[in-house]
């Protein structure tokens, strides 16, 4: 029969695991919100001033199903910031593009971990910034929907 000490330690482990899952869920929701905010701003960027942004190429992972695949998003944050810097105007303003991207990077690292040994396998086909954001929004939504509540 299990002792009271082993029961309490397994309860503590379960609570810790639940807490981690809740935190993970919060980080995913934060990342999703930030990506949706960016996409929304770009799609409303005086509607058709958008084509100037569409000249930039972004790379998507061959397959993204796990949190470690967020390495592929982290690898593309530099180019994403470059696009935001170039497209700042009266009609498209992020108060602080650097800070916005920095916050996304922090969230990504919290989710995937700080281990950078995982090498992203990018798809051969590149994407516009809009398709890139849509793809990562779908990734977040997929992970959130399959996470235990």
């Amino acid at each position: 029969a299990p002792t009271s000490s082993s029961t309490s330690s397994s309860t503590a482990e379960a609570q810790q695991q639940q807490q981690q899952q809740q935190q993970q869920q919060q980080h995913l929701e934060q990342l999703l919100m930030d990506l949706q905010e960016l996409l929304s701003r770009m799609e409303n960027y005086r509607n058709l001033k958008l084509p100037r942004m569409l000249t930039f190429k972004f790379y998507l992972p061959k397959q993204a199903t796990e949190l470690k695949d967020l390495q592929c998003l982290e690898d593309e944050l530099g180019p994403l910031r470059h696009v935001l810097d170039l497209t700042q105007s009266k009609s498209f303003q992020l108060e602080d593009a650097e800070n916005f991207i920095s916050n996304i990077r922090v969230t990504v690292v919290k989710l995937k971990g700080s281990d950078n040994t995982f090498e992203c396998q990018f798809d051969d086909e590149s994407a516009t910034v809009v398709d890139f954001l849509r793809r990562w929004i779908a990734f977040c939504q997929s992970i959130i929907s399959t996470s235990p509540q």
């Epitope: 005086r46 509607n47 058709l48 001033k49 084509p51 100037r52 569409l54 000249t55 930039f56 190429k57 180019p79 170039l86 105007s89 009609s91 086909e125 590149s126 516009t128």
Partner: antibody
């Protein structure tokens, strides 16, 4: 039908001023960038710059900055390219083109400008 | 200033495959576009965003990209494909640039 119709052939003398036009129809002219492209006789295409008719936001190629002026009148769906003082080296075909999905998808028929010295 | 490099000319016989390349330092991060210009006519967009074909352009026209080089491929070349082909892209400061153009000659 989506189209851009440009003004006709121009024959000018060096030092003259000139304004050529490009009229859009069949789409919302305000919300697409209009680019201007030069093609000198027997040569390739050169991007001159682009204008956004809704607010007249303009971007010039460094090679053409200060040499030409781009403008637009959204009330009559027309973009303009003008010179204050023409030179013989301005002799070329000038095309306007609509910028969509980051490419020039619709082109005008071109305006031939000949400048004699 | 930023340059896109194309071969001046390419010659093929009808029914063969023509490949026209375009090289530029920014191409790993910037999409390329291809235009066809027949003698005495305005240019026509044949490929956008490296690989996409506008409606009305025959399937014989395709585009690909690898590193700093993009390629326009015309399979089963026809006499009517005889034209100048220009690649276009944007430099890092968002200024647009055309390559010098490639004259495609369809032999025979």
């Amino acid at each position: 039908e989506v189209q851009l119709v440009q003004s006709g052939t121009e024959v000018k003398k060096a030092g003259d001023s000139l304004k050529i036009s490009c009229k859009g129809s069949g789409y919302n002219f305000d919300t697409y960038w209009i680019g201007w492209v030069r093609q000198m006789p027997g040569r390739g295409l050169e991007w001159m710059g682009t204008i956004y008719p809704a607010d007249s936001d303009t971007r010039y190629s460094p090679s053409f900055q200060g040499q030409v002026t781009m403008s637009a009148d959204k009330s009559i769906s027309t973009a303009y390219l003008q010179w204050g003082s023409l030179r013989a080296s301005d002799t070329a075909m000038y095309y306007c083109a609509r910028f969509s999905s980051s490419a020039y998808d619709i082109w005008g028929q071109g305006t031939m400008v000949t400048v004699s010295s | 200033s930023y340059e896109l490099t194309q071969p001046p000319s390419v010659s093929v016989s009808p029914g063969q495959t023509a490949r026209i390349t375009c090289s530029g330092d920014a191409l790993p991060r910037k999409f390329a576009y291809w235009y066809q210009q027949k003698s005495g006519q305005a240019p026509v967009l044949v490929i956008y965003q490296d690989t996409k074909r506008p409606s009305g352009i025959p399937e014989r026209f395709s585009g690909s990209s690898s590193g700093t080089t993009v390629t326009l491929t015309i399979s089963d070349v026809q006499a009517e494909d005889d034209a100048d082909y220009y690649c276009q892209s944007a430099d890092r400061s968002d200024s647009y640039v055309f390559g010098a153009g490639t004259k495609l000659t369809v032999l025979g």
